[in-house]
């Protein structure tokens, strides 16, 4: 057969109108002409092309091809001639000040912040060579130089990740109901009930020893023990398996003896054996139909014509002559569009193709990173290149703790709290914000001073009942919180001075809340009877439900602003899922009763998702794209609840529309709230008033009663008819259609006044609930009965 790539020298053939005819008479899509790829394979599609000059930000390959400058010397050849990775190009490269050279034998530069971070980013590990000990005196330094609390050493778990914390340990004593394999010789510990059960569980088979079991051990003689029924096969390792499992290709015995000494697969006399060992009826051999999975029943039957010799079989790329007919195929990175023509595969359609940015090219794709991140050339994931090392901050009811994700050292940020569940941070100001459910207050402090009660500032302590979710808008300097007792969502300035209730209707059990100040949206979870995840503008307009099906107890939610996805954990379904910011492209990443036994908080950073689990009393992490690589970050935590990542890349800077306006605070008398950026015509912000006041006709000033002139001039999305309902004492209800910036009725006091004591619900263990139990039965009692607040755990 002729070379399938070159095509035949048969009669000339005209190409379709949207195709280009190569000199060798091949037809290629016209758009491939002058794209710097030799698609014709005789270079005729690249002849007579206008000369291309590379941009200043590009690298010019030796053959004139242009590639991004940052792809030069990155370990992958992007130039067709490989000149971007050549010795000549790369040895000239000097690493800039903020980068570290990987040594004289390498031309690779890595961010200086990756030096001594416990991960080998240079091929030879030069970035981790000669690093000083980082660990505190009470910590253990792992072989990979991460730090570990001393209590984790020799505890039977590989906490370091390289096994170094479990090397050279004295043999631990077996538990009270455990058996030591190999006598006292330091073997494994196995449950006592596994001893003398006719199955070898110890490597040395000591759990089935004759002297121990009072009978010949199943492996004591060369002959295996007889099985109970004739329909069973006796494994050499002692166990009995179904006789039908013998020689079935599956290893069912521990020692695989059910697949030993098996005859080679042969077909019956009236059958044909395919190349892969399967059998088909002999009459199907050479019947011009492919019956064997590998097509071998039709191999060697006909010596017919080679269609590939004529116009390459009509294939745009590769033509393969078959015994019957022919087949068009494509090179890597291309797919058949119409059985003959190859088109580029858009690998970027797969949202998980890259950890951040995916750029599709003809025949291949390339991953890139957002500013502030750099590609780790070993894992191909984007890693933070700027700023201090990221840390994970979490609450455990009585404390706020911090774990450095690079050094892995573990510290207490705020001790001696009463009942803290929700928290968030403001990275630029180094402040931490948290809610205490027992004291019914929202606090703030500088992180380095937060352990001192005198430095803890009370921001909100009025009309709070059960503030279970908290989020900081670091751009517009606001805090948002959910209150499951009052059934409200509120906003306040970060100093607590000005506040407003945004939502007080259609909330059942609001819990987690997250904000996207770059686009002007907030997101929250509600684990009430109609559990859902909702979204609205940061000013309370354009409320919409994103998830309402296959959702039961959504606890934590978090946003990945870069990939524009929302992640959440569901503690009833034991799932970790994600959706895009519009509620589409839903994915369940992990479904596990083990790792997601009772998840509560969730956070995302780089290529990982982190979550807390109340039942496991641990923090887990996994790959955020596929849910794989699940590992435990910390355990024995006693009620770990909310969790956030502290790193400057988690809170990118953006313009504050309220401060950019001609008038300070957007000209608003009270609150200036960012509006959702739905289109280029969206307003940048809207003004808001306290719960007892109304916006005036100028939409900026606040008045005690609606200004009569303004009732009909307002945006319909904001207009609401205020119903005549029973209100808190002293509140006026105005029966008129009037725009009060929020989508809600203004109210003076919270739905449950802070002076009212709420009866305590009994503490019910989740495991005792029947499937029909209402979500609301799942309470965990607040320790401070005087306050009368029940904190409910979805």
């Amino acid at each position: 057969a002729a070379d399938p790539l070159l095509g035949g020298q048969g009669p000339a053939k005209d190409c379709e109108k949207d195709q280009f005819q190569c000199r060798n008479e091949r037809c290629i899509p016209s758009v491939w002409r002058c794209d710097e790829d030799d698609d014709c394979l005789d270079h005729s599609d690249e002849d007579d092309c206008p000369k291309k000059t590379c941009a200043d930000s590009d690298f010019t390959c030796d053959n004139g091809h242009c590639i991004h400058e940052r792809w030069k010397c990155d370990g992958e050849e992007e130039c067709p001639d490989g000149s971007d990775e050549s010795e000549a190009t790369c040895t000239k490269q000097v690493c800039p000040a903020e980068k570290l050279s990987c040594g004289p034998t390498s031309h690779k530069c890595v961010p200086a912040s990756w030096r001594c971070d416990g991960e080998k980013d240079c091929e030879g590990g030069a970035d981790e060579a000669g690093c000083a000990t980082l660990c505190a005196p009470h910590e253990f330094q792992c072989g990979n130089r991460s730090c570990l609390a001393a209590v984790f050493v020799c505890d039977g778990d590989d906490d370091c990740g390289d096994g170094s914390d479990e090397r050279g340990c004295a043999d631990p004593a077996c538990g009270p109901r455990e058996f030591r394999c190999g006598g006292d010789g330091g073997g494994a510990c196995i449950p006592e009930r596994w001893v003398c059960d006719r199955q070898f569980d110890c490597e040395d088979r000591s759990d089935e020893a004759a002297e121990l079991c009072g009978r010949p051990g199943p492996g004591a003689t060369s002959a295996p023990a007889a099985c109970a029924t004739a329909s069973q096969f006796a494994c050499r390792s002692g166990e009995c398996v179904h006789l039908g499992w013998r020689c079935d290709g599956d290893r069912d015995c521990k020692d695989k003896s059910d697949e030993a000494d098996c005859p080679l697969g042969t077909c019956r006399g009236d059958e044909f054996q395919c190349g892969d060992g399967t059998c088909v009826l002999a009459i199907k051999h050479c019947n011009q139909e492919q019956d064997c999975p590998d097509g071998s029943d039709e191999a060697g039957c006909l010596q017919g014509l080679n269609e590939c010799l004529h116009n390459n079989g009509g294939c745009s790329h590769i033509c393969t002559d078959l015994k019957i007919g022919f087949e068009c195929t494509c090179p890597a990175g291309f797919q058949l569009l119409d059985q003959k023509t190859c088109g580029d595969i858009d690998e970027c359609k797969d949202p998980d193709a890259c950890s951040q940015i995916c750029v599709n090219y003809k025949g291949y794709f390339k991953c890139e990173c957002y500013p502030g991140y750099e590609m780790d050339l070993l894992t191909k994931n984007c890693k933070a290149a700027a700023g201090k090392s990221p840390s994970l901050i979490f609450t455990n009811r009585h404390e706020v703790r911090r774990i450095d994700l690079v050094k892995r050292n573990y510290s207490r940020l705020i001790p001696m709290l009463k009942n803290v569940v929700a928290l968030d941070v403001e990275v630029a100001t180094n402040r931490i914000y948290w809610c205490d459910l027992s004291y019914r207050k929202i606090y703030s402090a500088y992180m380095d001073k937060a352990s001192d009660p005198k430095e803890q500032e009370v921001l909100i302590d009025e009309q709070l009942h059960s503030p279970e979710g908290l989020a900081v808008d670091w751009v517009h300097k606001h805090i948002y919180w959910t209150d499951s007792g009052n059934k409200t969502i509120s906003v306040a300035t970060v100093d607590g001075g000005r506040r407003r209730t945004l939502f007080s209707r259609n909330l059942s059990e609001p819990r987690a809340i997250a904000v996207d100040p770059l686009r002007g949206f907030m997101y929250w979870s509600d684990w009430g009877d109609q559990a859902k995840i909702e979204k609205s503008g940061l000013n309370g307009v354009d409320r919409q439900t994103l998830v309402s099906d296959n959702i039961e107890w959504p606890n934590g939610i978090t946003l990945d602003l870069l990939s524009q996805r929302l992640y959440w954990v569901d503690s009833k379904l034991h799932q970790l899922s994600s959706i895009d910011f519009s509620g589409g492209n839903r994915k369940t990443l992990i479904s596990s009763t083990d790792f997601l036994s009772h998840p509560f908080g969730i956070a995302v950073f780089e290529d990982k998702v982190f979550w807390t689990d109340l039942e496991n009393e641990a923090i887990f992490s996994a790959n955020r794209l596929n849910g794989l690589e699940i590992s435990i970050l910390a355990e024995n935590l006693n009620n770990p609840h909310d969790i956030v990542i502290f790193h400057e890349l988690k809170q990118p800077r953006a313009p504050d529309a309220c401060e950019l306006s001609v008038q300070p605070n957007g000209g608003c008398e009270y609150l200036c709230l960012p509006a959702p950026q739905i289109s280029s015509h969206s307003p940048k912000y809207t003004c808001a008033c306290p719960d007892t006041m109304w916006l005036g006709p100028d939409m900026k000033r606040c008045y005690r009663a609606p200004q009569s002139t303004s009732t009909t001039t307002l945006a319909s999305t904001m207009t609401r008819t205020v119903p005549a309902t029973t209100r808190a004492p002293g509140t006026t209800v105005h029966r008129s259609t009037y725009q009060n910036h929020s989508t809600e009725t203004p109210s003076l006091t919270a739905a449950v006044p802070s002076s009212v004591s709420v009866p305590r619900a009994p503490s019910i263990s989740p495991s005792t609930l029947s499937p029909a139990t209402s979500n609301h039965s799942q309470h965990y009692a607040n320790e401070d009965s005087k306050m009368g607040s029940t904190v409910t755990a979805a």
């Epitope: 302590d461 006041m693 606040c702 808190a728």
Partner: antibody, heavy 118, light 108 residues
Framework: EVQLVESGGGLVQSGRSLKLSCAAS????????MAWVRQAPKKGLEWVAT????????FYPDSVKGRFTISRDNAKSSLYLQINSLKSEDTATYYC???????????WGRGVMVTVSS | DIQMTQSPPSLPASLGDKVTITCQAS??????IAWYQQKPGKAPRLLIR???TLESDTPSRFSGSGSGRDYSFSISNVESEDFASYYC??????????FGGGTKLELK
């Protein structure tokens, strides 16, 4: 109609203590921050204390911090100001004021005179 | 803390005059300034808030303006009941609350 009526003033010896009261009516007292503002004879106005709606937090300028204590009883719609270690410069008319939702003082009492003698 | 410097301390005027009082803050106060009138032996009365918003019972001859650090209060056509002391107040929802030193409007 909003009404604020102060009481408890008078002539007091330097170094002694005094407790002023303010009775509020005509509005839901428990929904508002309340404050005390004083005015020395022939002088300007000076803010001296503010208390939150529930009474859980209070604020003072540095000039009186440690000596003045503001408190409230929402059940009685009453506001109080305890002044300890009275000094001659505490001689002033003390006004009870309501802090409106937007932050300014929107209603005032008629004031009560405190004179500190040496 | 923010200081409010009010001037002049006293302002002689005749009936029908237009008078202006100024208040300068030690830093930008984002228009959060209120103006009060006080007559001898009486409590202060709120006239203007948020730089220029007149209270519902404030006559229209009173006005306010300003931004940043500099603010002014005017009476366009002085009437006999306007002779009193006037105070500016920088307010916010959190402390401190700072008054200007006051201006006494007197009959010339």
């Amino acid at each position: 109609e909003v009404q604020l009526v102060e009481s408890g003033g008078g002539l007091v010896q330097s170094g002694r203590s005094l407790k002023l009261s303010c009775a509020a009516s005509g509005f839901t007292f428990s929904n508002y921050y309340m404050a005390w503002v004083r005015q020395a004879p022939k002088k300007g106005l000076e803010w001296v204390a503010t208390i939150t709606t529930s009474g859980s937090r209070s604020f003072y300028p540095d000039s009186v911090k440690g000596r003045f204590t503001i408190s409230r009883d929402n059940a009685k719609s009453s506001l109080y100001l305890q002044i300890n270690s009275l000094k001659s410069e505490d001689t002033a008319t003390y006004y009870c004021a309501r802090r409106g939702p937007l932050g300014y003082f929107d209603h005032w009492g008629r004031g009560v005179m405190v004179t500190v003698s040496s | 803390d923010i200081q409010m410097t009010q001037s002049p301390p006293s302002l002689p005027a005749s009936l029908g005059d237009k008078v202006t009082i100024t208040c300068q803050a030690s830093q930008n106060i984002n228009k959060y300034i209120a103006w009060y009138q006080q007559k001898p032996g009486k409590a202060p009365r709120l006239l203007i808030r948020f730089t220029s918003t007149l209270e519902s019972d404030t006559p229209s001859r009173f006005s306010g303006s300003g931004s940043g650090r500099d603010y002014s209060f005017s009476i366009s056509n002085v009437e006999s009941e306007d002779f009193a002391s006037y105070y500016c107040l920088h307010y916010d929802n959190l402390p401190p609350w700072t008054f200007g030193g006051g201006t006494k409007l007197e009959l010339k």
